[in-house]
């Protein structure tokens, strides 16, 4: 196994993960792509807690550089033994891992929280509020509950989507950050096991 | 004062079809949820369908689908359900009522008969 | 669609008596439940909306209770504009649904 190689393929995954999050957050502020709501104020509150561009994007890209650049084969030594810097530097990783592990917590509580709760919207009673908070998240089972809201259009479909897009991306973010606790325990206590001929693909 | 002022009653042909208007007054017309409600002589009360007339977000009761036809007009503050191939059981009393910040606000109703 | 039944279908009461009109519903619909009262050739008239929430220029007398399927109106000391018929509704989603009316007249 090559801690290093793998430590290197989870810091791609998690660019790519982060930058996810960050587009789904972003839209949650354009429902139906308009931007009246946002300047309205008339978005959930779990909207402003920025989950997916600073939970699941922005903190996560501090672990995932920190995974790609362990693959570097400039690492300085220690004693004469190359390796011994390496297994501090894999050591050190499990350290971004564990605020990896606290950005995509975030950001899948956070999402859990705005599914359950449900979209800010106008009802069919002509009121703004949150019409779905007292159903438990019960009515992400019905559908036909859905047309409650009607403004803006689809906002129920919209959030129900981007905040399940948030759910999943910071879940195998977390999966992610927390094998890269273990790869880096593993890698910091067996040392870089692969030599530079050895090439395996992550 | 808030209030929906209905179109007055109808009579017509089996075959053809009806347009009823719905004017409403005394608050902003496109933050209110226009409902439309059906009631023949001595019965209960049957929903057809709703128009927000901000965005018009449409949404009818399947029983009425193709029956019935919402449509609104913001510039002159007024929403229309218009009723096609009309038949004895579309004789009724047909409600608008505007739900907003102020409640419920409902129109006296027009009266559609449908008679040979 | 959901269901609604209302109970009784009628009943007679004096000025100053209290009463309880209840509704039962198909489906689990929360607290999304309203109630209305209509004069005979009137428009009928919101008076609760969410179960419990008193409609503008409603009087205190009138109070909604219940959650789930079961929901209840009560009117304590009846006055002689309370008669006529009530209506109960559900705005759980669409289509709204109403029961079949509960008639109050005067004994």
């Known amino acids: 196994m090559c801690y290093g190689k793998c430590a290197r393929c989870i810091g791609h995954s998690l660019v790519g993960l982060a930058l996810l999050c960050i587009i789904a957050n972003i839209l949650l502020y354009f429902p139906n792509g308009e931007t009246k709501y946002a300047s309205e104020n008339h978005l959930s509150r779990f909207v402003w807690f920025f989950s997916g561009i600073v939970g699941g994007g922005l903190l996560m890209l501090l672990p995932a550089f920190v995974f790609i650049g362990l693959e570097q084969d400039d690492c300085c030594g220690c004693c004469g033994h190359e390796n011994c810097g390496k297994r501090c530097a894999m050591l050190s990783s499990v350290l971004a891992a564990l605020i990896g592990i606290a950005g995509s917590g975030y950001c899948v509580i956070v999402a859990a929280l705005g599914l359950a709760e449900g979209p800010l919207c106008l009802d069919s009673f002509g009121q703004w509020n949150y019409t779905f908070a007292s159903t438990e998240g019960q009515y992400l089972l019905d559908t036909s509950t859905w047309s409650q809201c009607t403004e803006p259009k689809h906002i129920v479909e919209w959030n129900v989507s981007l905040f399940s897009i948030l759910l999943a991306l910071g879940g195998i973010e977390f999966i992610l950050c927390l094998i890269q606790v273990i790869n880096g325990v593993l890698g910091g206590i067996c040392g870089f096991c692969c030599s530079r001929q050895q090439q395996y693909d992550c | 004062e808030v209030q929906v002022q209905q179109s007055g009653p109808e009579l017509v042909k089996p075959g053809a079809s009806v347009k009823m208007s719905c004017k409403a007054s005394?608050?902003?017309?496109?933050?209110?949820?226009m409902h439309w409600v059906k009631q023949k002589p001595g019965q209960g009360l049957e929903w057809i369908g709703y128009?927000?007339?901000?965005?018009?977000?449409?949404n009818y009761n399947e029983k009425f689908k193709g029956k019935a036809s919402l449509t609104s007009d913001k510039s002159s503050n007024t929403v229309y359900m218009e009723l096609s191939s009309l038949t004895s059981e579309d004789s009724a009393v047909y409600y608008c009522?505007?739900?907003?910040?102020?409640?419920?606000?409902w129109g006296q109703g027009t009266l559609v008969t449908v008679s040979a | 669609d959901i269901q609604m039944t209302q109970s009784p279908a009628s009943l007679s009461a004096s000025v100053g008596e209290t009463v309880t009109i209840t509704c039962r519903t198909s489906k689990n619909i929360f607290n999304f439940l309203a109630w209305y009262h209509q004069k005979q050739g009137r428009s009928p008239r919101l008076l609760v909306s969410h179960t419990k929430t008193l409609a503008a220029g409603v009087p205190s007398r009138f109070s909604g209770s219940g959650s789930g399927t079961q929901f209840s109106l009560k009117i304590n000391s009846l006055q002689p504009e309370d008669f006529g018929i009530y209506y109960c509704q559900h705005h759980y989603g669409t289509p709204w649904t109403f029961g079949g009316g509960t008639k109050l007249e005067i004994k």
């Open positions: 005394g608050y902003t017309f496109t933050s209110y949820v």
């Open positions: 128009i927000n007339p901000n965005n018009d977000n449409i």
């Open positions: 009522a505007g739900y907003g910040n102020s409640g419920a606000n």
